[in-house]
């Protein structure tokens, strides 16, 4: 009953003459233990006898005997662990067929058949490839041999085009009830160059002898492999030459589908064949060329060919580091003239005239000066010829106004109060002068550019300077105007005495002035309209009060005369010319009022008066007027007065007062 038995084994075992077989086998019986195990070769069931007949290779009996001549068969199993593994070593071709495993338990019987396939010669392994091989994509190559036996050592070796492959292969074996095999796995990154190449897996015995092999041809899918050829084979060509570039497809799997050409990475229009012809090349065709070819795997780009189109220098142009340039600055000139090969020699021109000794691309002027201005041009030369000289570049050299001078336009001499016209001149300037500056600054009129009009010129306008200005101001040396004017600052100054003037003093007055142009002057002294002298000093040996008064001095030069302010000369003197006056006359009737006044001439005025009688007796009066009221006859007599100021005293002569009796008094008498 098959349901009672469960036997596991590979089903078919492969081997070859002289090798061995190892048959992994396990069993399970549902009812009881295995009692008898017989290994048949090609068993056949005899219906009549109800038993299996055939060559017995092994029989497990009580003593476990093996039939004679079958020492090569070994039962490796045991009843304890349900193992029915067996081996035949060596194995022969005539062992091919069925191995019958007759198993008997107490109650059940079973015949298990295992196919044994023993070939005359070792059979080849099988190479297994993935469905698609693509360049540079790693894959695993498998070499599988449905054989493995503990008693027979084998080796699998990989070869590419007959040469052992360097990559390390991983070999594994399986001796299980599921499968028996030896397998070698190789990790491999196919390159385009492997396409069409033969990979071999060789089966070797323990001595390294090749027993069998399997071969496959690699079908490596890859982008087109390209090389580029140039004819003529020189990539340096001259302008006007023709050049052909050929894109060679050395390999492509699958076949290429499209072709294009690129210059400096940019596709060329309508160029889709493997040949690119450039007729009469121009300098613009200089560049890096490559072809791009695509197949189903992808596009491929060839290496770049650098095509250099040589040409004579093109018309030049001059680049100037700065224009306008400021005088004294550094200026660099650069000759720009595209050429291939680069120019080896340059010729420079200034205003059309060749500049000696300058043969390089750059021409430098360390300190630019006005005469360096003009047009600069250049010629460049290479092996193909001399380039055309371009129109040139203009250098403008800017500088402050030069040689600035001032001119007085007036007829000389200039007098104070005149209108003076000055002009500011210069020899050259770049850019043009656009304004002028004047020193000192004044509210003066500039009737036109560079002309200054000073109206009513002051005596003290001594020097004037002008500047002519463009981007910079250049100053002229100041011009002295030499303004002529009448003496100024005329005044009277007392030289002596140092203190106040007293009558009798020696007195000196000085006529001073602050300035005069011209310097030559004359002096005049005047008192109350009368001319006193013509010296700078006015002297009094002994001053008298009559000399007091208002004095002026005049100073004149050829331009005019100037008077000082009137100066008051004050003479101090003691009271003098004292006299007593009586308003009512010197005869007065008794009972009336007699008024005596002390009159005096004094400087400063009298501040104190004293009165005396004929006996020189001081009277008790201190005022200027002596008032007797009512006057008596006894008052008759002579009187005098004395006046005092801070200079001194003075007294009057006697004056007689006569007091007569009134008619009443006479009448009483």
């Amino acid at each position: 009953d098959s349901s009672k038995w469960n036997i596991e084994h590979p089903g078919t075992i492969y081997a070859w003459e002289g090798a061995c077989v190892w048959v992994p086998c396990t069993y399970r019986v549902l009812d009881g233990a295995l009692e008898t195990f017989i290994l048949f070769h090609n068993p056949e069931y005899n219906q009549n006898m109800s038993k299996f007949e055939g060559t017995r290779l092994y029989e497990s009996t009580k003593d476990g005997k093996v039939p004679s001549g079958q020492k090569r068969v070994q039962f490796l199993g045991n009843k304890i662990n349900n193992n029915c593994t067996l081996s035949i070593h060596p194995v022969h071709v005539n062992d091919s067929g069925q191995l019958g495993l007759r198993m008997v338990s107490k109650t059940e019987k079973w015949m298990e058949r295992i196919h044994l396939n023993v070939s005359e010669r070792p059979f080849p392994p099988r190479i297994q490839l993935p469905p698609k091989l693509q360049e540079s994509q790693e894959v695993t190559l498998t070499c599988l041999l449905n054989f493995s036996c503990y008693g027979y050592q084998i080796q699998l070796q990989w070869l590419l085009e007959g040469v052992p492959m360097r990559q390390a292969a991983v070999t594994s074996t399986s001796l299980s009830t599921k499968s028996v095999f030896t397998r070698s796995e190789l990790k491999f990154s196919p390159q385009w160059s492997h396409h069409g190449k033969i990979v071999t897996c060789e089966l070797h015995d323990v001595d390294g002898k090749v027993l069998s092999e399997d071969m496959v041809q690699l079908n490596v899918k890859h982008t087109p492999k390209l090389t580029i050829e140039v004819t003529p084979n020189e990539t340096i060509v001259r302008k006007g030459d023709s050049v052909t570039m050929t894109c060679k497809v050395n390999s492509s799997n699958p076949e290429y589908t499209t072709v294009s050409w690129l210059k400096d990475g940019i596709p060329l229009k309508e160029q889709n064949t493997l040949m690119l012809t450039l007729h009469e090349v121009t300098k613009s065709q200089t560049g890096r060329y490559c072809c791009r070819v695509s197949n189903d795997v992808g596009p491929a780009t060839s290496e770049k060919v650098f095509l250099q189109v040589q040409y004579a220098p093109e018309p030049s142009r001059v680049q100037i580091s700065q224009s306008p340039a400021v005088e004294g600055s550094e200026v660099n000139f650069l000759c720009i003239s595209p050429a291939n090969p680069l120019p080896t020699n340059y010729t420079w021109y200034h205003n059309g005239k060749e500049v000696q000794g300058r043969t390089e691309k750059q021409f430098q002027i360390q300190k630019i000066l006005p005469w360096h201005a003009g047009t600069y041009s250049c010629e460049a030369e290479n092996i193909l010829g001399i380039g055309e000289r371009g129109p040139g570049t203009e250098l403008d050299v800017q500088y402050p106004p030069k040689k600035v001078t001032m001119v007085i336009e007036n007829p000389t001499p200039i007098r104070e109060g005149d209108t003076v016209t000055l002009s500011c001149n210069y020899s050259s300037s770049n850019p043009i002068v656009n304004h002028y500056e004047w020193r000192p600054r004044g509210a003066w009129e500039e009737p036109s550019l560079g002309v200054l009009k000073i109206q009513n010129i002051g005596w003290n306008n001594t020097a004037v300077a002008c500047a002519a200005c463009n981007n910079w101001c250049s100053w002229a040396s100041p011009v002295t105007l030499n303004v002529l004017y009448a003496p100024r600052g005329v005044r009277v100054r007392k030289i002596k005495p140092l203190s106040e003037i007293h009558s009798g003093n020696s007195v000196s007055l000085q006529c001073d002035f602050s300035s005069s142009h011209p310097k030559e002057v004359q002096f005049f002294w005047e008192k109350n309209g009368s001319l006193l002298g013509k010296e700078s000093q006015l002297n009094f040996d002994s001053i008298s009060p009559e000399d007091a008064g208002s004095y002026s001095c005049w100073v004149n030069n050829s331009i005019g005369q100037t008077a000082s302010k009137a100066w008051t000369l004050e003479v101090l003197y003691a009271p003098r010319r004292l006299r007593v006056s009586m308003s009512q006359g010197n005869q007065v009737m008794e009972g009336k009022t007699a008024t005596l006044t002390c009159e005096s001439d004094a400087n400063p005025p009298v501040y104190s008066y004293a009165w005396f009688d004929w006996n020189n007796q001081s009277l008790p009066y201190s005022g200027r007027m002596l008032r007797l009221e009512p006057v008596k006859v006894q008052h008759s007599g002579a009187y005098w007065c004395q006046g005092t100021n801070r200079v001194g005293k003075g007294h009057s002569p006697l004056i007689t007062l006569t007091v007569y009796y009134s008619p009443q008094t006479i009448g009483r008498r």
Epitope: G328, T359, I365, K367, L369
Partner: antibody
Framework: QVQLQQSGAEQVKPGASVKMSCKAS????????IEWMKQNHGESLDWIGN????????EYNEKFKGKATLTVEKSSNTVFLELSRLTSDDSAVYYC???????????????WGTGTTVTVSS | DIVMTQSQKFMSTTVGDRVSITCKAG??????VAWYQQKPGQSPKLLIY???TRYIGVPERFTGSGSGTDFTLTITNMQSEDLADYFC?????????FGTGTKLELK
């Protein structure tokens, strides 16, 4: 034609100073700098310095700073070289040379003066 | 300062000879080299500038060559009036410097 006429030979005592002249003619004086060279007894030449008559700009070889002073007198188209604190090492022929129209300090010299011989001896 | 070395102080020659006077610069001076001729009692005269350009009026037998540090003045078909001192000068760097000179003498 372009000429640079130099003053005559000088015999001077150590410690003294000497001032030699170089008068230009045959070209616009203010458009070219004037360079000065020293030559010892027919041997190598030494560049002393230069002056530009246009703006009195001077430039000296470090070696001659403090020894040489260059001045110009535009009215007479003349450049002067004054050497001070003279020693026997200053005995040489001194040449004035016309410099570059484009004012380059890097130049070669096509117009040379007649030379002034200076002898320093006590 | 750039040193200009004229290793031969004196050179003996005969009329008709080809003479090469050398000058070595202490550092690269490109082609900024001039050659001068000086006869006894005279001022130097410019022969060559820019290493190889002949100055106006200079006979064709005088040629200059070289660049960088090595320069040569060649006189083909030497004449008796060529007996003189020859100086090289660099004008590539400041200050300008001259060679020590080479004197041509008759053998």
């Amino acid at each position: 034609q372009v000429q640079l006429q130099q003053s005559g030979a000088e015999q001077v005592k150590p410690g003294a100073s000497v001032k030699m002249s170089c008068k230009a003619s045959g070209y616009t004086f203010t458009t070219y700098p004037i360079e000065w060279m020293k030559q010892n007894h027919g041997e190598s030449l030494d560049w002393i310095g230069n002056i530009h008559p246009y703006n009195d700009d001077t430039e000296y070889n470090e070696k001659f700073k403090g020894k040489a002073t260059l001045t110009v007198e535009k009215s007479s188209n003349t450049v002067f070289l004054e050497l001070s604190r003279l020693t026997s090492d200053d005995s040489a022929v001194y040449y004035c040379v016309r410099g570059d129209y484009y004012n380059s300090r890097y130049w070669y010299f096509d117009v040379w003066g007649t030379g002034t011989t200076v002898t320093v001896s006590s | 300062d750039i040193v200009m070395t004229q290793s031969q102080k004196f050179m003996s020659t005969t009329v008709g000879d080809r003479v090469s006077i050398t000058c070595k610069a202490g550092q690269n001076v490109r082609t900024a080299v001039a050659w001068y001729q000086q006869k006894p009692g005279q001022s130097p005269k410019l022969l060559i500038y820019s290493a190889s350009t002949r100055y106006i009026g200079v006979p064709e037998r005088f040629t200059g060559s070289g660049s960088g540090t090595d320069f040569t003045l060649t006189i083909t078909n030497m004449q008796s009036e060529d007996l003189a001192d020859y100086f090289c000068q660099q004008y590539s760097s400041f200050p300008l410097t001259f060679g020590t000179g080479t004197k041509l003498e008759l053998k």
